[in-house]
């Protein structure tokens, strides 16, 4: 239904990584504009991205207020030259998004190995604690601040001279692993939230190898 010259948005999709959250939809507008509203299950609707010709809307500022809430968005379609116009039922044409719970669903961004340090036959590997856009008391929280011990990292490591990989896990941002003296190793890490049912793992970090800049060696 709706006016003859507007079509309802469709394929509403949440794109979210480390809580940076954008709602995307189709179609590219022809003689129409969109406005987005977002709400929690029990809250009031808040309008964003007024009368836009974009087919995406950044809703990060809204969802970071409480990343454990479940959000619903809707996209309204209006004729480009007459945003007061409504559909046949007396309301603007709109389509609802799927529900979205940031804490449970935001994708984990690709982690970065911050440093590694060898002391004798042990190597300490540190994963960067990436800053998110979630704020408390006017400070931005890190991924660890938000997820606490729900977030673990898996380390994959192997001798530069072979392909056999070993793994280690930590619920902090540091690993301490045993290595063979005189051997160079390569490392990659992955963020994991084991308690999740979807989006449990990040992509693997870039590989870092001993003998390159990030490392430090001490006898």
């Amino acid at each position: 239904s709706g006016t003859t010259n507007t079509v309802a948005a469709y394929n509403l999709t949440w794109k979210s990584t480390n809580f940076k959250t954008i709602l995307e939809w189709e179609p590219k507008p022809v003689n129409q504009v969109y406005t987005v509203q977002i709400s929690t299950k029990s809250g009031d609707w808040k309008s964003k991205c007024f009368y836009t010709t974009d087919t995406e809307c950044d809703l990060t500022d809204e969802i970071v207020k409480d990343v454990k809430q479940t959000y619903l968005a809707r996209v309204f379609s209006y004729p480009a030259g007459n945003v007061e116009s409504t559909g046949s039922a007396g309301e603007p044409l709109y389509e609802n998004s799927p529900e979205f719970t940031p804490y449970l669903e935001t994708n984990l961004g690709q982690p970065t190995i911050q440093s590694f340090e060898q002391v004798g036959t042990k190597v300490n590997v540190t994963v960067e604690d990436e800053r998110t856009l979630v704020r408390r008391n006017n400070t931005f929280l890190s991924l660890r601040d938000v997820f606490g011990k729900d977030l673990i990292y898996t380390l994959y490591y192997w001798k530069s001279s072979s392909s056999g990989k070993k793994t280690a896990k930590t619920n902090t941002n540091e690993f301490l692993i045993d290595v063979d003296k005189g051997e160079n190793y390569c490392f990659s890490v992955q963020a994991v939230i084991p308690s999740r049912t979807v989006n449990r793992k990040s992509t693997d970090s870039p590989v870092e190898c001993m003998g390159q800049e990030k490392g430090e060696f001490r006898e």
Epitope: V146, N171, T172, N173
Partner: antibody, heavy 117, light 111 residues
């Protein structure tokens, strides 16, 4: 954040304290219980995190139960088999991060519980 | 089990001076930095001063600062005021799910 009134209890009694919170959601912040015996330091009892999971000090040995299933915006502490050593001021406090982080940014005034025969 | 040992009480300080209180953990605190500092005055609940080792809590004067990593942490009060007379506690989370602990407290006396 405010604790319910304590009072005088007898050994072996069961104590239930409630912590009522306002202005924030228990789905986003955790709540910890901490006690302080007269003239002594602070002692962490346990925490219920924003996902409803509970964590306890090793000495709490099953006598202490924290829950938030009775009413919205309340967290309860139950202590079974009270002993004189449980005499203390009991505080509830909000965990800033929502998990068991030790960063408690809003505290109740505390309530005195005295255990005596 | 996580054990936090603080500077012995009491610690005396002169108005305008500087006070340093140490907190040593028996093992690394969670992620090496989830340690907090509290101030408590008689008859009052504790007040959060510092969290995550060095982040100043909301409304706390910048005279208070925290530092440290792993097992060794320090609370520094500079330009000490009479109002700073209190007992100070450190508290930390540990990697084991169940463990959070307070230090024994350090009483600061301002002369």
């Amino acid at each position: 954040v405010e604790e319910s009134e304590g009072g005088l209890f007898k050994p072996t009694d069961t104590l239930t304290l409630t912590c009522t919170v306002s202005g924030f959601s228990l789905s986003y912040y955790g709540v910890s219980w901490v006690r302080q015996a007269p003239g002594n330091g602070l002692e962490w009892i346990g925490t219920i995190d924003s996902s409803g999971r509970t964590y306890y000090a090793s000495w709490a040995n099953g006598r202490f139960t924290i829950s938030n299933d009775n009413a919205p915006n309340t967290v309860s502490l139950q202590v079974n088999s009270l002993a004189a050593a449980d005499t203390a001021t009991y505080f509830c406090a909000r965990d800033f991060y929502g998990w068991n982080s030790g960063a408690l940014d809003i505290w109740g005034p505390g309530t005195l519980v005295t255990v005596s025969s | 089990e996580l054990d936090l040992t603080q500077t012995a009480s009491p610690v005396s300080a002169a108005v305008g001076g500087t006070v340093t209180i140490n907190c040593q953990a028996s093992q690394s605190v969670y992620s090496n930095k989830y340690l907090s500092w509290y101030q408590q005055k008689p008859g009052q609940p504790p007040k959060l001063l510092i969290y995550k080792a060095s982040t100043l809590a909301s409304g706390v004067p910048s005279r208070f600062s925290g530092s440290g990593f792993g097992t060794e942490f320090t609370l520094t009060i500079s330009d000490v005021q009479c109002d700073d007379a209190a007992t100070y506690y450190c508290a930390a989370a540990y990697s084991d799910d169940s463990d959070t602990a307070f230090g024994g407290g350090t009483k600061v006396v301002v002369e």
